[in-house]
């Protein structure tokens, strides 16, 4: 084989692998670990970029990545990997991660558009929202590893921040 990257050892937990390969998808093959934005294609015998299959039926092998990809296309939203959901920045401004900084800071500059609880926060009446208060503190992306299978695939700083939240 040439040009196509070998999979990385370690990398993903079994739980993550099961989420990416539901119902014993492509059985009879040792599951391989691939970088975050890739999946193991057992017929090709290599890691493949999830980007290539997000428009296919088979995107189930990359469900989380593909959801995050479509989520980032929506303004004022970001994909939360822990919740595995597309989150509206408007609902968390005030305790927002950096993915929402641009959206929330713009919102705060125009208080007319803010919901009452956020207007209260601006005037110092910050509610003690213990459910969310620490949920988004200190969120740092873990950095992007160059993809061995697709060395041409490089994520921009914005994309990295969103994909590796």
């Amino acid at each position: 084989m040439s040009g196509l990257g070998r999979s990385r050892r370690g990398g993903r937990s079994r739980v993550d692998q099961e989420e990416r390969f539901p119902q014993g998808l492509w059985t009879g093959v040792a599951m391989r670990s691939c970088p975050e934005e890739q999946y193991w294609d057992p017929l090709l015998g290599t890691c493949m970029s999830c980007k290539t299959i997000c428009n296919h039926q088979s995107q189930r092998t990359c469900a989380a990545f593909c959801r995050s990809l479509s989520c980032r296309k929506e303004q004022g939203k970001f994909y939360d990997h822990l919740l595995r959901d597309c989150i509206s920045c408007a609902s968390i401004c005030g305790q927002h991660p950096k993915q929402c900084a641009y959206f929330c800071e713009n919102k705060l500059r125009s208080p007319v558009n803010l919901p009452p609880e956020l207007r209260r926060q601006r005037s110092g009446e910050v509610e003690n929202n213990s459910d969310n208060s620490g949920r988004y503190q200190g969120l740092e992306h873990r950095g992007s590893e160059a993809s061995p299978a697709l060395p041409g695939l490089k994520l921009s700083a914005d994309q990295v921040a969103l994909v590796y939240s």
């Epitope: 084989m1 040439s2 040009g3 196509l4 990257g5 014993g24 998808l25 492509w26 059985t27 009879g28 093959v29 294609d41 057992p42 017929l43 090709l44 015998g45 290599t46 493949m48 970029s49 290539t52 299959i53 296919h56 039926q57 088979s58 299978a149 697709l150 060395p151 041409g152 695939l153």
Partner: antibody, heavy 118, light 107 residues
Framework: QVQLVQSGAEVKKPGASVKVSCKAS????????MHWVKQKPGQGLEWMGY????????KYAQKFQGKVTMTSDKSTSTVYMELSSLTSEDTAVYYC???????????WGQGTLVTVSS | DIQMTQSPSSLSASVGDRVTITCRAS??????LNWYQQKPGKAPKLLMC???RLHSGVPSRFSGSGSGTDFTLTISSLEQEDFATYYC?????????FGGGTKVEIK
């Protein structure tokens, strides 16, 4: 609609090389893996290898290592399959086939007959 | 490599007949079994993928079943254009492998 158009039939002498082309249209060329399949006259289908046009990554069947070289040209959405040191065993129809990421080959070229004869 | 064995290698049938072709894998391939139809001088065409999912444009008289190692392709009522050679292919494990083919001829 998806189309894979292959180059015409070739007649070659033993020891020579041949390069077969497969021009893709109707989809994003770099998003799909292209495979090549060999079919000897009156026989079944034999998988040879594949190329990922995104980065020209290739993987060949063990049997074809050293015999086949696959390349692609993104500017013309064309993949190439070159066979070297031809013998009569290489006389066959060669097909390019697009991989659908579900384990199957959803679209095929019309085939290129390569005849090796002295 | 996974071996794919098709049976019968050929069969004779008439228009309107129900035809069944079987394909056996040498090891478990889950449901990653595909069927192709090939007519003389033409390229193979994908009929069905993932055991029973019809490819676009394929008539509903074709159906597939099975899982693990044993699979069948059924043509409920054979039509003139169905006389061809049929190949199975496993899509579960590298490298992809094909069955030897089943030729459906006119009786």
């Amino acid at each position: 609609q998806v189309q894979l158009v292959q180059s015409g039939a070739e007649v070659k002498k033993p020891g020579a090389s041949v390069k077969v082309s497969c021009k893709a249209s109707g989809y994003t060329f770099t998003n799909y893996v292209m495979h090549w399949v060999k079919q000897k006259p009156g026989q079944g289908l034999e998988w040879m290898g594949y190329i990922l046009p995104y980065n020209d990554g290739t993987k060949y069947a063990q049997k074809f290592q050293g015999k086949v070289t696959m390349t692609s040209d993104k500017s013309t959405s064309t993949v190439y399959m070159e066979l070297s040191s031809l013998t009569s065993e290489d006389t066959a129809v060669y097909y390019c086939a697009r991989y659908d990421y579900e384990g199957s080959f959803d679209y095929w070229g019309q085939g290129t007959l390569v005849t090796v004869s002295s | 490599d996974i071996q794919m064995t098709q049976s019968p290698s050929s069969l004779s049938a008439s228009v309107g007949d129900r035809v069944t072709i079987t394909c056996r894998a040498s090891q478990d391939i889950s449901n990653y079994l595909n069927w192709y139809q090939q007519k003389p001088g033409k390229a193979p065409k994908l009929l069905m993928c993932y055991t029973s999912r019809l490819h676009s444009g394929v008539p509903s008289r074709f159906s597939g079943s099975g899982s693990g190692t044993d699979f069948t392709l059924t043509i409920s009522s054979l039509e003139q254009e169905d006389f061809a050679t049929y190949y199975c292919q496993q899509g579960n494990t590298f490298p992809p492998t094909f069955g030897g083919g089943t030729k459906v001829e006119i009786k």
